[in-house]
Structure formats: C-alpha cells, structure tokens
Interface confidence: low
C-alpha cells in the first residue's frame, strides 16, 4: 500500500519543492518557518522548516476553518534536510472551498511517543496567501519561421478573480539558461502570446506562470511544464530577413518616384510626351494668343510667368468653342474674390442657355510667382455661350461683346452652383499671404467653414460608399479629410493640417459641388476637396451634375 | 497554575441524556478553545465536540443532532449536552483546551498527549 500512495504524492512534493527550498533558507537558530499557500479551489499546500531537524518524526497539517464544519489534516513529508510539505486536499479540484472572509487556523503537530507536540500554529488567510496552479495545456497554435502563436489554459483557479490575473513568460534560446531568459509580462488575463523574432530552423522551449492581483502575500505559480517547440526553416535566398524585401521595394519606389518628378518638372520634351499618353485634348495656345507666340517664340511657361502689365495680354481670334482669357495680376484677382461678397448680385439672367463655367485647368497653365508656392495652379475662368452666336438678340451674362474681355460677375440664385468663385479656403492656394495665419482646428462637424459639399461626378466615383452620412468628430490634424485622393503640390499647406479662417459669410461663395445634396447623393461633412487633377472637367460633365441645368 | 475539572459523568440507560461540565482555572476562555475527547478502552482518543474562541462548533460525524457543546465564559465552564445516548458512546471523556487552535480528529493516538491542557476525565456508560 505504501508504493501507490507514495505515487500521488510525488507529484506534489515536485511541486511543493521550490516553496521549501526558497523558506528553509529562513529557519534559523532553532526557530521554525511555517508557510502555506492557497490554490484558489480546494488545495492549501504547506511548507515547514526547522533548524536542527527532528529526526524520525511524524508531523502533519491540521487545518480547522473558522466557519466551516470540516477539518483536514496531511502528513508532512520531507523534501530536504530541514524541511517538510504537504497538500491539504480539501475537496474536488474544482470546488470552491474557501471565500475570501474565511481564516483557517492551521497547525504543524508532530508526535513524541504516544503525544503530539504542536510546533507551529498561524491564523491563515487564503485569499490573501494565494499562489495558483501551473498553468497547463500549452500548445503551438502557428509557427513560422520568426514567430510563434503558443496558447494555454489555468487550472484550477477561482472564478472570484474574474479577469485580474497576470501572467509572466520566459523562452528558452539555445545555448542559454532559464535564469538567462528575459520575462515577457502580461499584465492581463491574456492566455496566449505571439513570440516575435525568432531564428529559422531552432528549437526552442517556452514556460509561463500566473499569479493574482489580489492578496497581500500572494506569489507567482510554479512555472509551466516546459513547451519545446521549432521555428519553420527558412526558404532558400527568401525570408532570411522578412523586412529587407520590403525595405529595398519601397526604397527603389522611393527613388523611381522622385526621378519620375524630377523628370516631370525639368524635361521641356515631357510636355508633348505627357499630353499624347493621356490623350488629353488640349488645344493649342498658339492658336488663341497669336501675339504671345510671336513675342515669347511657342514658350507657354514664358508667357504666363512674363512679368508684362495684363494689358499686352489681347487675345487673337478665338476658336468657337472657348471665351476670352482673361488674365488679371496676382492681387487684383484674390481682392476681387474676397470682395465679391460686397458686390450687389445682379437680376436674375432671362437666358436658359447661358453658362459660365469655372474650373481649375492645372494641367495646362502654370504661373510660376515670387511670392508663391513652388508650383501653383492658375485659376482660369472660361465663359461659354453655345448659343450667342445663333440667338445674338438673347442677353448673355458673362459673355463678351466685343474684343476686349468682360469682368466676370458673380450670378445669383440657382446659377451660383454653376458658376462662383472658389471659397476662401480655396484662395489659399494662389495666395496665402492674403488671408491670416492659421487657426486651430474646426471642431464642431458642418459648423462655420465646413459646408455640406457634394463632388462632381468623376470625383464621386473614386469615393468608397462607405462613406455615406455619418457624424464626423473633429479632424485629425496632419491627415487629410479625403484620405482617398492623391493631393496635388499645392495642397501641401493643408495637408499639414492648417486651416483657414473663414474670411466672412460663405453665401454665394461655393464650389460647382456645393449644392445641398439630393437624393441618392453623396454627402459629408467637413471635406476638404483638393482639386481635380486626374483630368479635366468637360463641360458636358459640368452640365451633367444637376439635371435642372442641362442646356 | 492551569486546571481543568470534568464533571457530570455517570451510567445512563440507552436513549438517556446527560450534561457533562468542564471548569477552567488559571486562564480564560477567550483565548482558548475548548473541547471534549473521549477514549474507550481498546480504542484511539477521539475529538467528540469543540467550541472556539471565535464561536465555531465541531461535532464528530457519530454525535451530530444528539450532542450539544456551549460554554459560560463568565462561569470559565463549558458543557456537552449529551441526548439520545448510545451503547457506543460508553468511554472516558476528557475535557482540554489549548490556545487559540485547532481540534485534532484522527491524528491522536491518545489522550492527555496531545497538546494543551486536559482534565483527568469523568467516566460515562450508556447501557442497552
């Protein structure tokens, strides 16, 4: 009988070990060291320590709860010279023994002849002496070759704790010992762990320990029994260093797209070149500006960054598709557009068929200003009049009379969708200087600045639909609102996250988009709209976007 | 000088009662637990009840629903109250105390060697 008993307590004495040899170290000079542990469930486990052993003596644990009707007792057995463990079962593994108000009075007795001698006593609080089980059913749910996904289970521990417990993990490299090996902490109830940068092809063991929050002397669990696991070999010439490939891809992206800029920006030849591959149909300026072109010899760029008075610009004779250019200086424009607020609106136009368009044509006129931004864009306003020619009687707001070129003028009512100034966000773009320095951030959707905007056409179909109404929190400073498109060169002062105040009442001041929107169409809040530079706006596609203004 | 007195022992007919005492002197209950042992002849001591310093009671599984265990701490005395008596529970019945402690149920050999302060018994028989 004695071999099968002694073959369930081995296990416990193995577990029992660490506790005695880290407290017999404590009994000196005859005094003795009495500490146990509580499982959490039904285990205390106890260690005694006594200097100047007694020899062949019997001892045991005898565990008396203050408010429960049981007692129970468990031999001590030796686990070294001076010191002895056992493990007072008090019930199934997984019952829930104790509380947290109980106090066991706990005893070490030992027997002297026919008597038994009590030899340590102390009032026991379990849960503020915890110490759980090991945890167990460790196991390697993915490995690769630099990392590995090990998961496991606690045993045995009480549902009081919910979810406050922390775990603590160590691995084992070749080569090293455990006392080497550097603690991974989790400071929840996270039972499982993905370990990162790992070598190829390498054996590997891992350990993990759990320990509660609460309790004033409660300790780390026996470590784990050992998980010895292999990292995936390396394939040839490939994964050796996961990140290079990428490192390398996106440095030679890097370099290409720079080369590619630069090539765009310095290369006189890439003009024609550019325009043949995507087949824009651009008309020549040559034909519009005859003087130009005899003066400055077919250079655009030399026209437009010509620093003449606007009067030697006159336009020639105009193909029937395109109004008078007209090209103001710098200031004059940006006052004009801030002022046009003031400007009284005019009657409502009597034509149906009149229009006057306004877009960015970026792709093809560039300034290039001392007091700018590297590149920027040149707003042009094109008017056009399909009609004026056959219905001459039919009065033509925004049209030319004659050969010298018209101010354009602000329309009214429902034409003020079609045909505005940009907002003054917008005026930022040609003239920063003109407006004040930044303001923080908007921080209420659809306030003041953040008009409902609604996107043409070509521009709706790059956005996700995801992006249907939703409230918008405030935006985040250096990312911008359309995350989706690629910003042109002169967005970058609003792509750090500057905005700009609005310079007073935003009526009549709107995009072609800036119409409250309709059914079914896209609407959001506080977007800022770079501008279009994937490709021109026609004016079929201008006139698409409200069947109210079809010609 | 510690003392225990039992008292109240004697021969009852089977389905009886009887009420033993125990009168301390030189210490005070409340920091002591007190308990009953009894020994038959032939047989291991056995913890019958315990009343403890926090008001804890223990009955040995033979004893529950007949016997009853209090104590007058004014008086430093503490009772069994024994109903329902049975043959088998004929024996010696020693009074002890010790402080602030647990009862021992199935670890003692026998009694007066345990731990603490033990009376010298009172005899009770249970005849059928």
């Known amino acids: 009988m004695a071999a099968p008993a002694l073959s369930w307590r081995l296990p416990l004495l193995i577990l029992l070990l660490p506790l005695a040899t880290s407290w017999a170290s404590a009994a000196v000079n005859g005094t003795s060291q009495f500490t146990c542990f509580y499982n959490s469930r039904a285990n205390i486990s106890c260690v005694w320590s006594q200097d100047g052993a007694l020899q062949d003596t019997s001892c045991q644990v005898h565990a008396w709860p203050d408010r429960r009707r049981w007692n129970q007792t468990c031999e001590l057995l030796p686990v070294s010279q001076a010191s002895w463990a056992c493990n007072l079962i008090l019930g199934a593994p997984d019952s829930q023994k104790l509380t947290t108000v109980d106090i066991v009075t706990l005893r070490v007795l030992c027997r002297e002849g026919v008597r038994w001698r009590v030899m340590a006593i102390q009032d026991f609080k379990p849960f503020e002496n915890l110490r759980l089980m090991a945890p167990i059913s460790l196991q390697v749910v993915h490995v690769e070759t630099h990392r590995c996904n090990i998961s496991w289970e606690i045993s045995q521990a009480s549902h009081y704790f919910e979810r406050h417990l922390e775990f603590e993990a160590r691995t084992l490299s070749p080569g090293h010992t455990w006392e080497e090996a550097p603690l991974l902490t989790l400071k929840q109830k996270q039972e499982w762990i993905c370990l990162e940068t790992l070598t190829p092809d390498t054996q590997y063991e891992f350990q993990v320990r759990v320990k509660p929050l609460q309790g004033e002397f409660t300790t780390w669990s026996p470590w784990s029994q050992p998980l010895a696991f292999r990292t995936k070999p390396a394939a040839l010439g490939k994964d050796t260093i996961p990140w290079l490939g990428h490192l390398l891809v996106g440095l030679s992206g890097a370099f290409g797209f720079i080369i590619l800029v630069y090539l765009l920006i310095n290369c006189r030849n890439t003009g024609p070149w550019l325009k043949k591959v995507l087949k824009c149909n651009t008309p020549d300026p040559s034909k519009f500006f005859s003087q130009l072109s005899s003066e400055h010899g077919g250079d655009v760029q030399k026209w437009l960054s010509s620093p003449f008075p606007s009067s030697s610009f006159s336009p020639g004779g105009l193909a029937p598709e395109i109004s008078p250019l007209e090209v103001l200086e710098r200031d004059k424009v940006t006052q004009l557009l801030l002022q046009q607020d003031k400007v009284p609106e005019p009657a409502s136009l009597s034509s149906n068929h009149s229009l006057t368009s306004c877009f960015t044509n970026q792709g093809y006129f560039f300034f290039h200003l001392p007091d700018a931004l590297e590149i920027e864009a040149c707003q042009v306003y094109f008017t056009y009049d399909p009609y004026s020619e056959e219905d001459p009687d039919e009065g033509v707001a925004g049209a030319p009379t004659g050969s010298s070129p018209q101010p354009l003028q602000p329309l009214s009512g429902e034409d003020d969708a079609y045909c505005t100034f940009p907002s003054r966000d917008d005026l930022l773009l040609f003239s920063p200087s003109l407006l004040g320095g930044p303001s923080p951030p908007s921080t209420a959707p659809g306030g003041s600045g953040a008009g409902e905007e609604r996107m043409p056409p070509s521009l709706q179909e790059r956005v996700p639909r995801d992006w249907d109404p939703q409230p918008l929190g405030p935006p985040t400073p250096g990312v911008p609102d359309l995350v989706d498109f690629q910003p042109p060169p002169e967005l970058v002062l609003r792509e750090a996250g500057e905005e700009v105040p609005d310079a007073g009442p935003r009526e009549g001041v709107s995009f072609p988009w800036s119409r409250p929107p309709g059914q079914g169409e896209f609407r959001a809040l506080n977007a800022r709209l770079p501008l279009n530079t994937d490709a021109y706006l026609s004016l079929q596609e201008l006139q698409g976007q409200d069947p109210t203004h079809l010609v | 000088q510690v003392q225990l007195q039992e008292s109240g022992g004697g021969s009852v007919q089977a389905g009886g009662s009887l009420r033993l005492s125990c009168t301390a002197s030189g210490f005070t209950f409340d920091d002591e637990d007190m308990g009953w042992y009894r020994q038959a002849p032939g047989n291991e001591c056995e913890l019958v009840s315990s009343?403890?310093?926090?008001?804890?009671?223990y009955y040995a599984d033979s004893v529950k629903d007949r016997f009853a265990i209090s104590q007058d701490n004014a008086k430093n005395t503490v009772y069994l109250q024994m109903n329902s008596l049975k043959p088998e529970d004929t024996a010696v019945y020693y009074c002890?105390?010790?402080?602030?402690?647990?009862?021992?149920?199935?670890?003692?050999?026998?009694?007066?060697?345990?731990?603490?302060?033990w009376g010298q018994g009172t005899q009770v028989t249970v005849s059928s």
């Open positions: 009343i403890g310093s926090l008001g804890r009671r």
């Open positions: 002890a105390a010790t402080k602030g402690g647990s009862w021992l149920d199935s670890i003692l050999a026998s009694c007066q060697g345990a731990f603490g302060y």
